[in-house]
Interface confidence: medium
């Protein structure tokens, strides 16, 4: 009988572990959905507001290929930076390639010099993985240098020609990105 109880207890524990795993997956999925939703809203807002405007990028935004970039002139913490970008129908910069990184760092040198600029990269609290705002992982060559010793949430930023990491609650400039309008001509 004792063996039977022990077996039942082990089965229950296994079930509990599976449920916890499922809950963790669901939480991750929910987080990803929320970000995707914000992303879609930003894209829609950008498309609608730009429909009346013939130029590929709004005033004060820089164009490179299919993207428009806005280099902020104000400081904010990482989360507020993301909110600010969303208000403009954009998101924090997502660097897809070395070419894009080179363009950004080259532009920053011309505009402002070697300040710190938040980008849309943050470290997942559980796994420690770096994730862009759309839930994708950065390519191996675009992982932040481990610079932050922070116990708090860690986010990515660009300085000079490097991608670095810092406590998300520190104040920095930031860079927003949105799709450039395709010319209808």
């Amino acid at each position: 009988k004792l063996l039977q109880v022990s077996t039942i207890a082990m089965q229950q524990q296994e079930k509990l572990i599976q449920q916890e795993r499922a809950l963790l997956n669901f939480t991750e999925w929910k987080r990803s959905c929320a970000l995707q939703m914000k992303y879609c809203q930003a894209f829609m807002q950008n498309s609608l507001s730009s429909a009346h405007n013939s130029s590929p990028c709004p005033n004060n935004w820089i164009q490179n290929r299919e993207s428009c970039y806005y280099v902020s002139e104000i400081w904010s913490i990482w989360h507020t930076s993301q909110e600010n970008c969303l208000k403009e129908g954009s998101t924090l910069l997502q660097i897809e390639s070395k070419e894009e990184m080179d363009f950004i760092t080259g532009s920053l040198r011309k505009i402002k010099g070697s300040y710190d600029y938040w980008v849309g990269l943050s470290q997942d609290g559980h796994s420690g993985r770096w994730l862009w705002q759309d839930g994708s992982s950065p390519s191996p060559g675009l992982l932040p240098a481990e610079r932050s010793q922070s116990a708090n949430q860690v986010c990515g930023y660009v300085k000079s020609n490097s991608l670095l990491s810092s406590n998300c609650s520190t104040w920095k400039y930031f860079i927003c990105e949105k799709y450039a309008l395709r010319s209808s001509v």
């Epitope: 004060n60 902020s72 002139e73 104000i74 400081w75 904010s76 600010n84 208000k87 403009e88």
Partner: nanobody, 117 residues
């Protein structure tokens, strides 16, 4: 066009205090977050403190926390920076800035603060 004029800078001994003022004209600044930044010789401009439009939220750079206090008087369209326990490393030109995302960054001409040991 908004104009920001900083005043209250000067020379002071380490441990001393100064109160900087930033008077705005041409625009009511009560709707905007405001910030103080500073630039020391040969260094980049750095964030010092920020205050929300209503004045209920403030943030400070780690280097000035507990020593500097940012405040505002919306009726006077003015922002203040009370600087206590000043250190030689606080020597810089101090600028006041409207934190209005999406529009050009308005900043004053700055006021010099010199702290000697």
């Amino acid at each position: 066009q908004v104009q920001l004029v900083e005043s209250g800078g000067g020379s002071v001994q380490a441990g001393g205090s100064l109160r900087l003022s930033c008077a705005a004209s041409g625009r009511t600044i009560s709707n905007y977050d405001m910030a103080w930044s500073r630039q020391a010789p040969g260094k980049e401009r750095e964030f010092v403190a920020r205050i929300s439009g209503s004045g209920d939220r403030t943030d400070y750079a780690d280097s000035v926390k507990g020593r500097f206090t940012i405040s505002r008087d919306n009726a006077k369209n003015t922002v203040y920076l009370q600087m206590n326990s000043l250190k030689p490393e606080d020597t810089a030109i101090y600028y006041c800035q409207i934190q209005d995302f999406g529009s050009p960054s308005f900043s004053g001409q700055g006021t010099q603060v010199t702290v000697s040991s």
